[in-house]
Amino acid sequence: LTCLGGFASPGPVPPSTALRELIEELVNITQNQKAPLCNGSMVWSINLTAGMYCAALESLINVSGCSAIEKTQRMLSGFCPHKVSAGQFSSLHVRDTKIEVAQFVKDLLLHLKKLFREGQFN
């Protein structure tokens, strides 16, 4: 066990495993989507660059009452080194562009698959 900030935290999950699990969850969301995801909620689009995990969570954290993305939000928190608050915005947000959660998930999935293929796990 590693001691971090007063907690005995679980042993670290290998980044490749964590990324693969996140990809699998996003695939699951896109494949099982029947009604509009999160009732068609809109979120800020983000630049898919370094720091995108926190930015993605900053966007998704403002979606309320959507059980379909709870697991994704949890997984993203594992990639983001700081606690994200609702209403928080990073420089990675495309502030003039809002997209549906479904499209946000698809865009994120495509980019994460690319990162996985290239071996960029962090």
């Epitope: 001691c3 971090l4 900030g5 007063g6 907690f7 935290s9 679980p10 670290p12 999950v13 964590a18 954290i61 309320s64 009452g65 959507c66 059980s67 379909a68 993305i69 709870e70 697991k71 939000q73 949890r74 997984m75 993203l76 928190s77 594992g78 990639f79 983001c80 080194p81 700081h82 606690k83």
Partner: nanobody
Framework: QLVESGGGVVQPGGSLRLSCAAP????????IAWFRQSPGKEREWVSC????????IYSDSVKGRFTISRDNAKNTLYLQMNSLRAEDTAVYYC??????????????????????WGQGTQVTVSS
């Protein structure tokens, strides 16, 4: 803000069900986590359940033995603990951050912290 109950003394192999209630707010609106702390050790994350109950996660040390659940009508969260071992002896705490999702266990202590805690309930596993 949170109130735990259901602790006690139990023999190895026995069972207990812990409860977590919140008199001042609606537990059903938030993800809730359980932690535990043994004497002389750091507080350890045990389990978490998301608001909908669709995402439940467990530490390796309790997986297959403990079950987290919620009854939103009663505004109560439960931790069913089976096949208890001496090493499960600890004070058990429930916590929330008034978010709908659980925090990834690997993020705990790295800035991802829960802000609302109970006072804890003692669980002792001894023959």
């Amino acid at each position: 803000q949170l109130v735990e109950s259901g602790g006690g003394v139990v023999q190895p192999g026995g069972s207990l069900r812990l409860s977590c209630a919140a008199p001042r707010f609606t537990l059903g609106s938030y993800a809730i986590a359980w932690f535990r702390q043994s004497p002389g050790k750091e507080r350890e994350w045990v389990s978490c359940i998301s608001r909908s109950g669709g995402d439940t996660i467990y530490s390796d040390s309790v997986k297959g033995r403990f079950t987290i659940s919620r009854d939103n009508a009663k505004n109560t969260l439960y931790l069913q603990m089976n096949s208890l071992r001496a090493e499960d002896t600890a004070v058990y705490y429930c916590a929330t951050d008034k978010r709908s999702f659980c925090y990834a266990p690997e993020g705990l202590g790295k800035g991802w912290t829960y802000d609302y805690w109970g006072q804890g309930t003692q669980v002792t596993v001894s023959s």
